[in-house]
């Protein structure tokens, strides 16, 4: 087989039809789409293309210039009257720049064989395109049969003599793709077998998915895959000041289009999305979480003087609980409850009040009751102690009333009703409460516990005792019940305003049982436990006073 090496054919004067063709063609040459990267565009090469034709009298370059006097590289061949044509045109080495699939766009004109007299037997209306991969930029000196055929190229529209007369040129555009490529570059070759062709432009390109920012993720320029149906998964990187839960990905199609986005980036706390970037929250604004769309004004009673704030600072005397969301207003403890009233029933007190005028901006207001027992003489108060019961409870009261039971009778109490809310414990300020002073009613006194024997004689017993621990009012009198032991049904009662008595008319050397109880305006208390004392025999002297255990 013939070698394709050597033999650059020098330009010659072009026939009229080529000139007409170029004028028309130039008007149709438009810029490439953004997803196409040119590896070669014969229209933009200013100097020598460096292509070679074999044989020398086959393809020839037509030296034309455009309106800016830039050269137009056009190759033509028109050996339609001669048999066995095998004219080759070889490009220079083309780098594939990492692309594994490339596209070849040819713009050409083709003469209609029917419009050529006498050439019907030898005239062809197609030409062939081949390629050869090579890592070597000087690898054109190869055999014909080492070239791989891409396709036979036919014209969609051929032109006739009539078209020439009307100055209408029919420019064909054909695109073919080649892949997968495995070497650094390649050569193209165009074989003419007897057609009348003008090759106006050759553009070799690959497709890419152009770099793009989607959902705050940057996806880089991505060369499409070798397979025409292949989708390449591409990872995006979040723009400055953005974060992601699910790494952003998109798929680059063979046509250079981004498809099927997965995941997204979000502006981090303190930043918001504006025009595809994450911009800082300005002072007075904050964003607590990446999942929030935009910066918001600080809530009431809070501020921030920082850029990129993720929360706002509470104003003086305002607070935020840890459990309060950063979007919630800062709040303060409530003011004191108002209009407290009391209702005393013996040793129970019912308190009622209305809520504070200022809840501090919170809904979680509750009440706490502090109980103090006060000495009316000394004016000193002390905690009430554990014996007092609160109904329903002492603290965390949601209702505006409470009942205290098991209080001491005839005792001065001060009840402090304090309003509290979720930030009361954060505030160093004074407690906010309303005080109510009450005195419990008198009640029956508690039992007498401490009885001492006095002078004991054969017919009498003298006793003394102390006031009950809890008189529960003013003691009006004592009632002393006594009887001879084992004669309980036959008892005697003495009343005394003092804490001493003498029982007369007793039998000598007999055991008597004594019980004492006190009375207030509220009634009698219960009798004391039984105390036993024995009168002296007839002949004995009276005994000394001593305390009965």
């Amino acid at each position: 087989p013939a070698s394709l090496a050597g033999c650059y054919s020098a330009p010659r004067r072009a026939p009229l039809w080529t000139c007409l063709l170029l004028c028309a063609a130039l008007r149709t040459l438009l810029a490439s789409p953004s997803n196409e990267v040119n590896l070669l565009d014969s229209r933009t090469v200013m100097g020598d293309l460096g292509w070679i034709a074999f044989p020398k009298n086959g393809w020839e370059e037509i030296g034309e210039v455009d309106e800016n006097y830039a050269p137009i590289h056009t190759y033509q061949v028109c050996k339609v009257m001669e048999q066995n044509q095998n004219n080759w045109l070889l490009t220079s080495w083309i780098s594939n720049e990492g692309a594994s699939r490339i596209f070849i766009e040819l713009k050409f004109t083709l003469r209609d064989c029917n419009s050529l007299p006498g050439g019907l037997g030898t005239c062809k209306e197609t030409f062939n395109m081949y390629y050869f991969e090579s890592d070597d930029q000087n690898g054109r000196n190869i055999k014909e049969n080492q070239y791989i055929k891409i396709d036979t190229i036919a014209a969609d529209e051929s032109f006739t003599e009539l078209d020439l007369g009307d100055r209408v040129m029919k420019l064909n555009t054909e695109v073919r793709d080649v892949g997968p490529l495995s070497k650094k570059g390649f050569y193209l070759a165009f074989q003419d077998v007897g057609a009348c062709i003008a090759l106006v432009s050759v553009r070799v390109y690959y497709k890419k998915c152009p770099s793009v920012v989607r959902h705050l993720a940057v996806f880089p320029d991505t060369i499409t895959g070798a397979d025409s149906s292949q989708l390449l998964e591409v990872s995006g990187s979040c723009v400055n000041h953005s974060v992601t839960d699910e790494p952003p990905k998109m798929h680059c199609s063979a046509e250079g289009e981004w498809l099927v986005p997965i995941g997204k980036c979000m502006c981090k706390a303190g930043y918001e999305e504006k025009n595809g970037t994450c911009q800082v929250c300005r002072p007075g604004f904050f964003k607590a979480s990446p999942h929030i769309q935009s910066c918001g004004k600080c809530p009431p009673h809070s501020y921030t003087h920082e850029e990129a704030s993720t929360s706002c600072v509470c104003e003086k005397d305002y607070f935020r609980r840890e459990s309060d969301p950063p979007t919630m207003a800062c709040t303060r403890p409530p003011s004191a409850p108002r209009n407290a009233i009391s209702n005393v029933n013996e040793t129970s007190v019912f308190l009622e009040w209305i809520p504070p005028a200022d809840t501090g901006g919170r809904k979680d207001v509750s009440y706490y009751i502090a109980c103090k027992k006060c000495n009316s003489h000394a004016g000193v108060c002390e905690e009430c102690g554990g014996h007092v019961r609160y109904l329903p409870r002492q603290s965390g009261l949601k209702n505006t009333s409470v009942m205290m039971v098991d209080l001491l009778a005839h005792t001065n109490y001060t009840f402090e009703i304090e309003a509290v809310n979720g930030v009361s414990d954060l505030s160093p300020g004074a407690r906010q409460y309303v005080s109510v002073n009450v005195t419990t009613n008198q009640a029956a006194p508690s039992p007498v516990t401490n009885v001492k024997k006095g002078k004991i004689a054969k017919n009498s017993i003298s006793l003394s005792w102390q006031e009950p621990d809890r008189p529960n009012g003013i003691i009006l009198e004592y009632e002393i019940k006594y009887f001879e032991k084992d004669q309980e049904t036959s008892y005697t009662i003495i009343k005394s305003k003092e804490t001493t008595i003498t029982a007369e008319g007793l039998k000598p050397a007999s055991v008597y049982v004594f019980q004492i109880r006190a009375r207030t305006a509220a009634g009698y208390g219960v009798f004391s436990r039984r105390f036993e004392f024995e009168t002296t025999p007839v002949f004995a002297a009276s005994s000394d006073q001593s305390q009965i255990p």
Epitope: P283, F285, C298, Y303
Partner: antibody, heavy 120, light 111 residues
Framework: EVQLVESGGGLVQPGGSLKLSCAAS????????IHWVRQAPGKGLEWVAY????????YYADTVKGRFTISRDNSKNTLYLQMNSLRAEDTAVYYC?????????????WGQGTLVTVSS | DIVMTQSPDSLAVSLGERATINCKAS??????????MNWYQQKPGKAPKLLIY???NLESGIPDRFSGSGSGTDFTLTISRLEPEDAASYYC?????????FGQGTKLEIK
């Protein structure tokens, strides 16, 4: 009671340096942005610089950018203005002023000012 | 930078009368529905005092005869009934973007 007290002013030659201080009390200094504002004799107010509570946000007027540095020490409740390459036109009373808490914030408390005179 | 221009440079108003001072910004000082415009009063030898923030909000402790209005680029400070202690210089200031520029000031005298 909120108080801001400037100090460090005085007479300095052109090209010289001076460091102003602003001592703060009566509020939680570390959460407040503070401004420096100056007033040339017989002239109006001119904003100079700003620093946020955590020193994360700092702004300067174009006239002082590259020459003045605003800083603060929250442990000492003190704001500073380091002034280098001083010029005659920097002669002014320098005030520190607290950024307010009511949005949108104004400068709600001001110091009494300290006079800086730049003259040969 | 945003340039703030006050008018008039000075004015004299009788006691009990209304005083109006205007301030025009070279570009809008509004952001997200708020006007970042403040007004200050300064008496000779004293530090300035904040009167109005956010174009129309009265600072606490300031008498209600002072009021502010406006949005975008045009703002007004009004003193409804002039008192002797209102004689002072008044400054507008924008805090929408740095640098936080002041107007040149308006000197108010009592007639």
């Amino acid at each position: 009671e909120v108080q801001l007290v400037e100090s460090g002013g005085g007479l300095v030659q052109p090209g010289g340096s001076l460091k102003l201080s602003c001592a703060a009390s009566g509020f939680t200094f570390s959460t407040f942005g503070i401004h420096w504002v100056r007033q040339a004799p017989g002239k109006g107010l001119e904003w100079v610089a700003y620093i946020s509570g955590a020193s994360t946000t700092i702004y300067y007027a174009d006239t002082v950018k590259g020459r003045f540095t605003i800083s603060r020490d929250n442990s000492k409740n003190t704001l500073y203005l380091q002034m280098n390459s001083l010029r005659a036109e920097d002669t002014a009373v320098y005030y520190c002023a607290r950024y307010g808490t009511s949005f949108p914030y104004g400068l709600d408390y001001w110091g009494q000012g300290t006079l800086v005179t730049v003259s040969s | 930078d945003i340039v703030m221009t006050q008018s008039p440079d000075s004015l004299a108003v009788s006691l009990g009368e209304r005083a109006t001072i205007n301030c025009k910004a070279s570009q809008s000082v509004d952001y997200d529905g708020d006007s970042y415009m403040n007004w200050y009063q300064q008496k000779p030898g004293k530090a300035p005092k904040l009167l109005i923030y956010g174009a129309s909000n009265l600072e606490s402790g300031i008498p209600d005869r002072f009021s502010g209005s406006g949005s975008g680029t045009d703002f007004t400070l009004t003193i409804s009934r002039l008192e002797p202690e209102d004689a002072a210089s008044y400054y507008c200031q924008q805090s929408n973007e740095d640098p936080f520029t002041f107007g040149q000031g308006t000197k108010l005298e009592i007639k």
